[in-house]
């Protein structure tokens, strides 16, 4: 057999078996398993007398292992006494030693349990800057514990001075805690908070989980904006790949044309995201002519870390055409902003859904960061609707009380776009607050619709004008409603406000 | 015209290894990515691995360990290595190619190589 | 991992009829369902890519359809050479998966 160092184990008795005035009381220690013989046993006493045996060794039968047992007799103050005993082999190596320091007896304990419990991400599901892994140790018998953190197996440098420790009646619990980076805890290392108690380990692991549900990369490829495509006349079409693992291989993209013709000259952006992914974009410009007349662009993906290549493909949708109807809105004022307006615009039953946005003051596009527009949805018919909101200061308004809502679609004619006017003050801008120029229908709060609409302007709206429960061929979110002129005969009675 | 031809099947003891080859011919192998299938008599088609052109493998889960797939583009061969067989894996293997564009299935897969595991 | 599931596993039909076959995917695609159609004795054959492109030299009879997690293959007018057994394909994953494809749907004589 080859050379096999020992295994040592302290062997005690129960407290509770030891009667409390016995004046001497035995210990002992085992060392198993090795080979050659022999093993030297000597005890550390500290400042007690005692006598030691060593018996003599006995063979494992199945191994051909040896084993032995010293035991040691002390008397004395025994019971807070602390006692060494160490097993040297030298066959396994001159300096072959194991020390195991252990009291005279073990008392019935209860260990504890180890948990880590990690802080939550972000609301957006992303990890925060810094994660807390806070390593409950709980329901043990009160007693002497030591904590330590590792990381990936290795002993980590924490204060664990910030450790607190609880009694329940006859049980305790402790608690530590430990702070990350961010970079650290995406690292995929592994974290352990090691429990020493009685002589005992106990320990909890944890690492970033992998996602439940991995999406894998997936790639997207947009169209180009009406805007873009009908008014700047430089149409481009963006590839854009997203939650690729951030290594040495670099992401591949390949733009090309159905036709076979050449593709002109791509522009490449990458981006780290918060949750350690990459994002790669490529954007391609594309010539307005070609687009039109129906020619499909391919962007083809390959990265290392990619089972297969991705295309994705793009042309200009096809089916039937219809252009947008534009309404648009002012609220009136409300009671404590007085110096901002917020205007509405409504853009309904186009088709397709691809459209461009804009708002324009003083006969200048405004930057599109000034407004907020909801993607498109679909009407309940065939085509589609979405809002546009822009918020407006009273300089602004006093400037110049006109602001343009512009859709730019393919279908519009006769140059591809479709606008209205809006003033906030549409009595004082225009002349009368019975103007003839807005719809029969207003927005206007359907929490609020059994009261009377209060009027922009001063005006004062028709008694029969009421807030409807929403109109079937109004595709408004639910939060909107409609009002509905119900005057017969009339002239329609035109005003903008709050039911 | 695009070929895939199989070779290295037969039948083998549980617990044997084989060695599949998958010569291909008509078109740039190093271009395409490559993926074996198999089909079990009577049975569907199964996904056991895809090689990219980057020479990276991925595997069905339950051939992870078993199955190594390689390729040697200077030879355009393709190849799966099958260890510890047991009988449950007595199928027709194909050697197929994935699209060069990508993301759009198989467009061409061989014969087959039937591969028979029993004592 | 993505499961596919395609429905009915088998179909008897008439030459002439229209066959619907289905497969569902346990979470979307975004692109890349492929369908193939396969001879007894003989390897499969791609009909169909990315949802609904038909692949070069097959009849405009076949189609397929679908978005997100739905995806369907149609034959307008069964044909005597369209009994088969058809499968669909989740082709776009960008990991491993248990199984890419469907289980399976024999279109068999009425």
């Known amino acids: 057999a080859s050379t096999q160092s020992p295994s040592v184990f302290p062997l005690t008795r129960c407290c509770k078996n030891i009667p409390s005035n016995a004046t001497s009381v035995t210990l002992g220690c085992l060392a198993t398993g090795y080979f050659p013989e022999p093993v030297m046993v000597t005890w550390d006493t500290g400042s007690l007398n005692g006598t030691t045996m060593t018996l003599p060794a006995t063979t494992l039968t199945l191994s051909g292992h040896y084993a032995t047992i010293s035991l040691l007799t002390v008397s004395g103050a025994w019971a807070k006494q602390m006692f060494t005993c160490r097993v040297a082999h030298t066959p396994s190596s001159t300096d072959w030693v194991d020390n195991k320091t252990f009291s005279v007896c073990s008392r019935d304990f209860t260990p504890p349990t180890v948990k880590i419990l990690q802080s939550s991400c972000d609301g957006g599901g992303h990890f925060p800057p810094t994660i807390q892994l806070l390593c409950l140790v709980s329901g043990y018998t009160p007693g002497t514990i030591n904590i330590t953190w590792l990381e990936d197996g290795q002993v980590m440098d924490v204060d664990l001075s910030t450790a607190s420790t609880t009694q329940e009646g006859e049980l305790a619990s402790t608690q530590s805690e430990l702070t990350l980076s961010q970079k650290h805890w995406l690292s995929d290392r592994t974290y352990t908070c090691q429990v020493t108690y009685q002589g005992h380990t106990f320990e909890d692991s944890t690492k970033k989980c992998a996602d439940s549900n991995p999406r894998g990369v997936s790639a997207y490829l947009s169209r180009p904006s009406p805007f873009d495509l009908f008014i700047r006349k430089s149409p481009t079409i963006t590839c854009l790949v997203v939650d690729l693992a951030p290594s040495k291989g670099t992401v591949n993209l390949t733009w090309s044309r159905a036709s076979g013709k050449p593709v002109n000259h791509s522009t490449r952006k990458e981006e780290k995201q918060r949750n350690g992914t990459l994002t790669v974009t490529s954007t391609l410009p594309v010539g307005t002519r070609d687009w039109i007349e129906g020619e499909t662009y391919q962007c083809r993906v390959t990265h290392p870390h990619l089972p297969r290549a991705l295309m994705r493909s793009t042309t200009k949708t096809s089916g039937p055409r219809a252009a947008p109807e534009v309404y648009a809105f002012a609220t009136p004022e409300w009671p404590g902003s007085r110096d901002k307006r917020t205007l509405a615009c409504l853009i309904q039953n186009f088709m397709p859904e691809d459209i461009s946005v804009q708002w324009l003051h003083n006969e200048v596009q405004l930057p599109d960061a000034r407004h907020s527009t909801t993607q498109p949805r679909k009407t309940k018919g065939s085509g589609f609707f979405v809002f546009s909101r822009l918020e407006v200061t009273r300089a602004e308004w006093e400037q110049k009380d006109e602001f343009i809502c512009r859709a730019v679609h393919e279908a519009a004619s006769p140059s591809q776009t479709v606008q209205r006017a809006v003033s906030v003050n549409p009595g004082l801008a225009g002349g009368s607050a019975q103007s003839q120029r807005a719809p029969d229908r207003v927005l206007c709060h359907s929490g609020q619709q059994q009261g009377l609409p209060r009027a922009a302007g001063g005006s004062v709206p028709h008694p029969r004008c009421h807030c409807g429960a929403g109109r079937a061929d109004w595709p408004g979110p639910p939060e909107l409603d409609v009002c509905v002129e119900e005057a017969e005969g009339e002239a329609p009675w035109t005003w903008t406000g709050l039911c | 015209q695009v070929q895939l031809v199989e070779s290295g099947g037969g039948l083998v003891q549980p617990g044997g290894s084989l060695r599949l080859s998958c010569a291909a011919s008509?078109?740039?192998?190093?271009?395409?990515?490559m993926t074996w299938v198999r089909q079990a008599p009577g049975k569907g088609l199964e996904y056991v691995s895809i090689?990219?052109?980057?020479?990276?493998?991925w595997y069905a889960n339950w051939a992870s360990g078993r199955f190594t797939i390689s390729r040697d583009n200077s030879k355009n061969t393709v190849y799966l290595q099958i260890d510890s067989l047991r009988a449950e894996d007595t199928a027709t293997y194909y050697c197929?190619?994935?699209?060069?564009?990508?993301?759009?299935?198989?467009?061409?897969w061989g014969q087959g190589t039937l591969v028979t595991v029993s004592s | 991992d993505i499961q596919m599931t395609q429905s009915p596993s088998s179909v008897s039909a008439s030459v002439g009829d229209r066959v619907t076959i289905t497969c569902r995917a346990s979470?979307?695609?975004?692109?890349?369902l492929a369908w193939y159609q396969q001879k007894p004795g003989q390897p499969p054959k791609l009909l169909i890519y990315?949802?609904?492109t038909l692949a070069s030299g097959v009849p405009s009879r076949f189609s397929g359809s679908g978005s997100g997690t739905e995806y369907a293959l149609t034959i307008r007018s069964l044909k005597p050479e369209d009994f088969a057994t058809y499968y669909c394909q989740h082709a776009d994953y960008a990991h491993h998966s248990d199984n890419v494809f469907g289980g399976g749907t024999k279109v068999e004589i009425k």
């Open positions: 090689i990219n052109t980057y020479g990276n493998h």
């Open positions: 008509g078109f740039t192998l190093s271009n395409h990515d």
């Open positions: 979470r979307s695609i975004y692109s890349g």
């Open positions: 990315d949802h609904s």
């Open positions: 197929a190619r994935e699209t060069h564009h990508g993301s759009s299935g198989i467009d061409h």
